[in-house]
């Protein structure tokens, strides 16, 4: 009996430019003889429904149809037919199929590969054209993929134990696509600093599929209106 197992859940997520290993494990009732077996990896793009050969291994012959693609013959002996793709790009996302032949048996498995890019975030103060005691803070998130992103603003006063999400005076612009396929977006918070308590911490919070925890940039209102603190990237309310 020949069986192939891919990543549990059927999806693998990898960061842009990473050296990704797409898992494929072979289970066979007898010890594997790699000289009499074949492995072929196929890729189907998200955008068009055509399967392309990425890599093949047959006996003493192996060929990479995608530069740098490799299956380790040494690991193959112990049933690991995982495909390594160095420097993965956004356009290489899609369905990967691992096909194993141990004559006369054949088995296959598929996995979806998602390529993500993490946003970079920075906080800017724009006082141009603003009234006295009024400030506009801009939170720029750039270089992220996929397009779906959630940007919120939070504030925490000195006295209360938890932050609160700000919903008024927040405008988040449209996402803009970059030449490399990643996206940028800017969210703006308008503040009347005369109505806020000194010591209040404001924070731009970015949530994205590529991030395990949200990305935060903060500033603290001081008696002298505001300070975009040096620690604006310390991800910290304290």
């Amino acid at each position: 009996d020949l069986k192939v197992e891919m990543m549990a859940g059927g999806t693998q997520i990898t960061p842009l430019n990473d050296n990704v290993t797409i898992f494929c494990n072979i289970f066979y009732s007898q010890p594997l003889n790699i000289t009499s077996m074949g492995i072929t990896w196929f890729w189907k793009s998200l955008t068009f429904d055509k399967e392309v050969k990425v890599f093949e291994f047959f006996g003493d012959h192996q060929e990479a149809f995608r530069p740098g693609a490799i299956v380790s013959p040494w690991r193959l002996k112990s049933g690991d037919a995982s495909l390594r793709l160095p420097g993965i790009q956004l356009e290489e996302a899609g369905e990967y199929r691992c096909e194993v032949v141990v004559t006369p048996l054949k088995a296959q498995g598929t996995v979806q590969l998602e390529v993500v890019a993490s946003p970079a975030s920075r906080l800017l103060l724009d006082q141009v054209g603003m009234k006295e005691n009024e400030d506009k803070y801009m939170c720029e998130s750039s270089g992220f993929y996929p397009e779906a992103i959630n940007i919120t603003w939070e504030k925490q006063t000195q006295k209360f134990p938890h932050p609160i999400e700000i919903s008024e005076d927040v405008i988040t612009g449209p996402t803009i696509k970059n030449m490399d396929g990643t996206f940028n977006v800017t969210s703006c918070l308008k503040l009347n600093s005369s109505q806020e308590d000194p010591g209040t911490v404001y924070q731009c919070v970015v949530r994205h599929a590529s991030l395990h925890t949200p990305l935060r940039s903060n500033f603290t209102l001081t008696a002298a209106r505001h300070s975009l603190s040096e620690t604006e990237k310390t991800d910290n309310f304290s």
Epitope: F160, P161, P163, E165, D235, N236, S238
Partner: antibody, heavy 117, light 107 residues
Amino acid sequence: QVQLVQSGAEVKKPGASVKVSCKASGYTFTNYWMNWMRQAPGQGLEWMGGIYLSGDSTDYNEKFKGRVTMTVDTSTSTVYMELSSLRSEDTAVYYCTRRGDYFGDFWGQGTLVTVSS
Amino acid sequence: DIQMTQSPSSLSASVGDRVTITCKASQNVGKYVAWYQQKPGKAPKSLIYSASNRYDAVPSRFSGSGSGTDFTLTISSLQPEDFTTYYCQQYISYPLTFGAGTKLEIK
């Protein structure tokens, strides 16, 4: 990292007073407001009051007004909560707490005060 | 003072179950609600703030929802370590007030 270390357990007689301390470390002490909570055995949580750590502002729960006093010693980064005219129903674990960061608010380990004759 | 009425006071469930705890405020508190988990002999630990935002390092199986007067904490798939007590708290105004707690027990 931020740490709030409280004084040890106390046993008091009814009518006496107790003073619980909370020593803070790992952050700029005076920039914060410190709250005090208590929890009677097997019961829920109750806010007692709070103090701004620069020492110029307090806010007490009406229920405890006249019996509770919160003070600060900035030289040792320590906050104190004193409760007077103790009665058996004041038997509880007392906690100092500070507003948090993105992992949540900070709590001391708690101080058990037992009021018993 | 704002009263926070939490229900149920106790709840029996099994590992893997989905459970919901509710909290009702006596007046509009917007989204100024937090949820805590407290294990026996330990200080409470924050899970949720602003009604629906998870604190970092809190597992994604915990989620909060609601605004105004009605709030819920949902645990999507109970793990053995989740069987303990949960409290809601309003922080729109002083005095800060808590719900009476919900004790989650293994069925």
